[in-house]
Amino acid sequence: MSSKYPRSVRRCLPLWALTLEAALILLFYFFTHYDASLEDQKGLVASYQVGQDLTVMAAIGLGFLTSSFRRHSWSSVAFNLFMLALGVQWAILLDGFLSQFPSGKVVITLFSIRLATMSALSVLISVDAVLGKVNLAQLVVMVLVEVTALGNLRMVISNIFNTDYHMNMMHIYVFAAYFGLSVAWCLPKPLPEGTEDKDQTATIPSLSAMLGALFLWMFWPSFNSALLRSPIERKNAVFNTYYAVAVSVVTAISGSSLAHPQGKISKTYVHSAVLAGGVAVGTSCHLIPSPWLAMVLGLVAGLISVGGAKYLPGCCNRVLGIPHSSIMGYNFSLLGLLGEIIYIVLLVLDTVGAGNGMIGFQVLLSIGELSLAIVIALMSGLLTGLLLNLKIWKAPHEAKYFDDQVFWKFPHLAVGF
């Protein structure tokens, strides 16, 4: 088995990626500069720590979470890093152009990097549905389209619905999930005979996927609180997210055992269900008034996640061609919707309490925001899927799906790696 890219891709990928990188460097040269004010060095360090948490989540957390395939673990981790690095650069520019450009220059701050990392995280969530079926050249396209779509979605929601950074970024869960699922739907689905074993999980990669889940679990409170504008909101977000993910871990492990006829615990269920609470509280993490509510939400989210992991893969595998272990897409789509519904419930309770028609209008606005996020995710995902199907990208043949040897140089080329 040859470990080389096909010649055309070997020519196409470096040229495409390096040309793009050169273009990004030029854009940074002409249009960006650093924030000049650095009075408070202690504040700078604290601000950097939040960004660092997000980077750890993205690079290690999501990188390793998607690495459970028997023969595709190297590619999962490294391709994630590649997409993160590219996505952050493009997101910084895009956010700057969309929000600050009238002043002529994009001012880069640590907040810009924080925001860009969160935008790039969207791609890392989406790509779980297609990893193993695409090459790096295709992933570059996916990064560019998704970051652009998310940036524009956030800008539209911000301007039309008058929402702040946190509220419009928390659509990331449903956006990323539906984007990834719609891209997967466009890609060739059937796995030819003899390749079924490649999309199975193996012990060592599954352990690294669990490591990824642990990193995500530890840093999810940072993600949910990163864009809140006051200390009290951040404190509440951190606490509520922590309680929710703590309960979802207990629920995931016990629920997984409950779902198995012999009471065994499924690695795949646990990998994603431990994060369920964090996704479900995302939108309203700063609003939940007491720990027990966050814990109940974590419990419900954990049960939904385990239930989804048990019953949805069959459907997703048939319809979307998503392997059983890539459950992040439908997991996040369900849990993201749950989170949005919780927020809408809080709005409805406000309406009942206030007897104010204008708050009823808020409910409609929130439903409008959610609908817009889903529609843009599906449309841009389908567009991306169609683009990825173009012959120019020299996509891996179905027989080479989920195979590190297509992309990586292994000196020993060990059989059954």
Epitope: G43, S230, P231
Partner: antibody
Framework: EVQLLESGGGVVQPGRSLRLSCEAS????????MHWVRQAPGKGLEWVAF????????YYEDSVKGRFTVSRDNSKNTLYLQMNSLRAEDTAVYYC???????????????????WGQGTTVTVSS | AELTQEPSLTVSPGGTVTLTCASS?????????PNWFQQKPGQAPRALIY???NKHSWTPARFSGSLLGGKAALTLSGVQPEDEAEYYC?????????FGGGTKLTVL
């Protein structure tokens, strides 16, 4: 009593720079987002800039973007406004104000400016 | 965003008056966190109302805020001579803020 005290105003020529300071007393600056607001002679209030409590994010009114920079030193309990390339239309009394957030509904925090300084006058004239 | 307020209003002592604030971007909702300020000549502005209808501890009971017909509104009931001042609304626009042009309230 909680107070904000602005300083650094004065007369300056067009194109020059000036740095305003706003010192907080009887409260910890770190716990609050902070605003700069100005009022030209005989005119209404105009919001100028806002900085998050930890200094990580900043917003500016379109007419001052690229010329003004808001910053803070929480260890000194002080807020700053660096004004470059000053124009005649920047002549105004500059106020700093603190932003509070309060949860008065299940689904929303409300943001508002509760404490204002007495203002410092900036005159841009040749 | 352009915020429109009545440039001036006149009211008799003991009367009731409503000041409004409209946004060029459409209906004002609680998402805009409407704030109202009072400013007397030579003084710094003083906060009166936040979140459309919430009063500060120092705000007199005769002041009340609301949302009326897609506008933020400030109602003064039982107006006192000392209420003669300039009144400004402030709205939140996705992170940034904008003031209205102000309403000069005269108590005659």
């Amino acid at each position: 009593e909680v107070q904000l005290l602005e300083s650094g105003g004065g007369v300056v020529q067009p194109g020059r720079s000036l740095r305003l300071s706003c010192e907080a007393s009887k409260f910890t600056l770190y716990n609050y987002g902070m605003h700069w607001v100005r009022q030209a002679p005989g005119k209404g209030l105009e919001w100028v800039a806002f900085i998050w409590f930890d200094g990580s994010n900043k917003y500016y009114e379109d007419s001052v973007k690229g010329r003004f920079t808001v910053s803070r030193d929480n260890s000194k309990n002080t807020l700053y406004l660096q004004m470059n390339s000053l124009r005649a239309e920047d002549t105004a009394v500059y106020y700093c104000a603190r932003e509070l957030s309060k949860k008065v509904a299940l689904s929303r925090y409300y943001y508002y400016m509760d404490v204002w300084g007495q203002g410092t006058t900036v005159t841009v004239s040749s | 965003a352009e915020l429109t307020q009545e440039p001036s209003l006149t009211v008799s002592p003991g009367g009731t008056v409503t000041l409004t604030c409209a946004s060029s971007t459409g209906a004002v909702t609680s998402r805009y966190f409407p704030n109202w300020f009072q400013q007397k000549p030579g003084q710094a502005p003083r906060a009166l109302i936040y979140g459309s209808n919430n009063k500060h501890s120092w705000t007199p009971a005769r002041f009340s805020g609301s949302l009326l017909g897609g506008k933020a509104a400030l109602t003064l009931s039982g107006v006192q001579p000392e209420d003669e001042a300039e009144y400004y609304c402030l709205l939140f626009y996705a992170g940034a803020w904008a003031f209205g042009g102000g309403t000069k309230l005269t108590v005659l």
